[in-house]
C-alpha cells in the first residue's frame, strides 16, 4: 500500500509541478517594474519570456511579442530553452508514469517493467524540475544584475535640469511560481524513484517456489502470499519478507484467501 501511495503521490505532486512550470513559462510577469521610487505610477511595465506588457492606470493593457529571435539576449533564449526542456521532459515523464502507476493495469505488464517505468519517469521529473529551477534562477540572476546596474545610473541628468528615470525591474510572480513548481516536480520525481525501489523485484521472478527453512515449512505463492503461518528464520530470502509493504499492496491487485469467506 505504501508503494502505491508513494507512487501516486509522486505522480500528483509532479503533475501539479509541471502544470506550474507550464503556467510560469506562459506568464507575462517574469519581471515587473520596481515601484520603489514611484509607488503611484500611471504606467506599469512587466515582462515575460515571450512578450512585454504595459498596463496603464486607465485599465488599458498592451502586450507586444518579441518577434525577433536573433535580437533577444542569449540569457533569455537560454531561459526559454531550459523551461521548454523542463516542460517536454515533464510531459514525457507524466505519460510514462501513467502507465507505470500500480493502480492502473495495462495487459499483463510485469512489475519489473512498471518499476523501470517508474524510475524513468522519476528521473525525468527530477531533470524537469532542475531545468525549471535553473531557468528561473538564471532569469532572477539576470534581473538582480540589471537592477543594480540601473540603480547605479538611476538618474542621468540632462544639464542637471531634466531627469530621465530609468525603469528598474524586480522579481515577478512567475519566478515564484517557477521556483515552487520546479521544487514540486523535483519532489515528485524523488518520490517516484523511492516508489520504484519498493516495486522492483530483486532477483525474483515470482514463480511458485517452495523454500525450506530449518524447522519450518514456508511456501510462497505468486504475489508474495504465505501459504503457511510460520515465518521461521529465513534470512537467505529476506527481500521477500521486505514484501511486508508489498503484501499490503497486493491486497488491491490480487485476491487473498479472506476474499472467499
Amino acid at each position: 500500500m505504501a508503494v502505491t501511495a508513494c507512487q501516486g503521490l509522486g505522480f500528483v505532486v509532479s503533475l501539479i509541478g509541471i502544470a506550474g512550470i507550464i503556467a510560469a513559462t506562459c506568464m507575462d510577469q517574469w519581471s515587473t517594474q520596481d515601484l520603489y521610487n514611484n509607488p503611484v505610477t500611471a504606467v506599469f511595465n512587466y515582462q515575460g519570456l515571450w512578450r512585454s506588457c504595459v498596463r496603464e492606470s486607465s485599465g488599458f493593457t498592451e502586450c507586444r511579442g518579441y518577434f525577433t529571435l536573433l535580437g533577444l539576449p542569449a540569457m533569455l533564449q537560454a531561459v526559454r530553452a531550459l523551461m521548454i526542456v523542463g516542460i517536454v521532459l515533464g510531459a514525457i515523464g507524466l505519460l510514462v508514469s501513467i502507465f507505470a502507476l500500480k493502480c492502473i493495469r495495462i495487459g499483463s505488464m510485469e512489475d519489473s517493467a512498471k518499476a523501470n517505468m517508474t524510475l524513468t519517469s522519476g528521473i525525468m521529473f527530477i531533470v524537469s524540475g532542475l531545468c525549471a529551477i535553473a531557468g528561473v534562477s538564471v532569469f532572477a540572476n539576470m534581473l538582480v544584475t540589471n537592477f543594480w546596474m540601473s540603480t547605479a545610473n538611476m538618474y542621468t541628468g540632462m544639464g542637471g535640469m531634466v531627469q530621465t528615470v530609468q525603469t528598474r525591474y524586480t522579481f515577478g510572480a512567475a519566478l515564484f511560481v517557477g521556483w515552487v513548481a520546479g521544487g514540486l516536480t523535483l519532489i515528485g520525481g524523488v518520490m517516484m524513484c523511492i516508489a520504484c525501489r519498493g516495486l522492483a523485484p530483486e532477483e525474483t521472478n515470482y514463480k511458485a517456489v517452495s523454500y525450506h527453512a530449518s524447522g519450518h515449512s514456508v511456501a510462497y505463492k505468486p504475489g508474495g502470499f504465505k501459504a503457511s503461518t510460520g515465518f521461521g528464520s529465513n534470512t537467505k530470502n529476506k527481500k521477500i519478507y521486505d514484501g511486508g509493504a508489498r503484501t499490503e499492496d497486493e491486497v488491491q491487485s490480487y485476491p487473498s484467501k479472506h476474499d472467499y469467506v
Epitope: 500611471a42 512587466y46 512585454s52 504595459v54 492606470s57 486607465s58 531634466v162
Partner: antibody, heavy 118, light 113 residues
Framework: DVQLVESGGGLVQPGGSRKLSCAAS????????VHWIRQTPEKGLEWVAY????????YYADTVKGRFTISRDNPKNTLFLQMTSLRSEDTAMYFC???????????WGQGTLVTVSA | DIVMTQSPSFLTVTAGEKVTMNCRSS????????????LTWYQQRPGQPPKLLIY???TRESGVPDRFTGSGSGTDFTLTISSVQAEDLALYYC?????????FGAGTKLELK
C-alpha cells in the same frame, strides 16, 4: 452617446463641506476609471482625485489629501466627491472625466462651480 | 511631481497659418516598456470643458481633424496646427500622463490677429 453630468456645486463657507456628484450614461461605467479635475483662472487645470473601475485604486492630489474623499456607486452609474474643511483656494469649476487610452481624459462633464467664501 | 511648461503663453495667428506650440516636462515621459510618450494635448474653447485632441504624444483621437499633429519625445513636445481655422481659437493644454499626480501645463492661448 457618452455623457457626464456634475451636480452639487454652490456657495460654501470656509471650513464647510460639500458633496459633488457625477452621473454617467452612454457607456459601461463600471468598466472605466474616473477622475475629478478642477479649474481656476489662476491655476488652470488641476487634477484632484482618481478612482479605479472597481473602486480601487484611489489617488489624491497632495493639496486635497485628507480633506476630500472620492467614491463611486457602479450600479447607479454615479461618481462622488465628498469635500470637507473647504478653503478659499478650493474655489473652482469641478469636472469629472473618464479615463482613457494613454491615461488621457476622453470625456469631460460640463462642470459644477464650487465657491468657498465667507 | 512632474512640472509641465508650455510656451508661448499666447499665440496670435491669422486663418490658414501654420502654428506650433511647445510643451516641456521636468522628467521624461517616455515609457521604456512600449516606447510610448505619455503626453496628452487638450483643446478648451471658452465656456466648454477641455476636449481630448492627442494622446501618446502623437496619436490623434477619433474625430479630431488631421490638421492637428503631435510630435516630440522624452521631455520636449510640440502641437502643430497645419492650417488654423476660426474654430481652433482656444486654449491648448498639455498633460503629463506618465505618473501621478497627473499634471497640466499652464496652457497656450490661440488668438486671432
Amino acid at each position: 452617446d457618452v455623457q457626464l453630468v456634475e451636480s452639487g456645486g454652490g456657495l460654501v463657507q470656509p471650513g464647510g463641506s460639500r458633496k459633488l456628484s457625477c452621473a454617467a450614461s452612454g457607456f459601461t461605467f463600471s468598466g472605466f476609471g474616473v477622475h475629478w479635475i478642477r479649474q481656476t483662472p489662476e491655476k488652470g487645470l488641476e487634477w484632484v482625485a482618481y478612482i479605479g473601475s472597481g473602486s480601487r485604486p484611489i489617488y489624491y492630489a497632495d493639496t486635497v489629501k485628507g480633506r476630500f474623499t472620492i467614491s463611486r456607486d457602479n450600479p447607479k452609474n454615479t461618481l462622488f466627491l465628498q469635500m470637507t474643511s473647504l478653503r478659499s483656494e478650493d474655489t473652482a469649476m469641478y469636472f469629472c472625466a473618464r479615463f482613457y487610452y494613454g491615461n488621457s481624459f476622453d470625456h469631460w462633464g460640463q462642470g459644477t462651480l464650487v465657491t468657498v467664501s465667507a | 511631481d512632474i512640472v509641465m511648461t508650455q510656451s508661448p503663453s499666447f499665440l496670435t495667428v491669422t486663418a490658414g497659418e501654420k502654428v506650433t506650440m511647445n510643451c516641456r516636462s521636468s522628467q521624461s515621459l517616455l515609457n521604456s516598456g512600449n516606447q510610448k510618450n505619455y503626453l496628452t494635448w487638450y483643446q478648451q474653447r471658452p465656456g466648454q470643458p477641455p476636449k481630448l485632441l492627442i494622446y501618446w504624444a502623437s496619436t490623434r483621437e477619433s474625430g479630431v481633424p488631421d490638421r492637428f499633429t503631435g510630435s516630440g519625445s522624452g521631455t520636449d513636445f510640440t502641437l502643430t496646427i497645419s492650417s488654423v481655422q476660426a474654430e481652433d481659437l482656444a486654449l491648448y493644454y498639455c498633460q503629463n500622463a506618465y505618473s501621478f499626480p497627473l499634471t497640466f501645463g499652464a496652457g497656450t492661448k490661440l488668438e486671432l490677429k
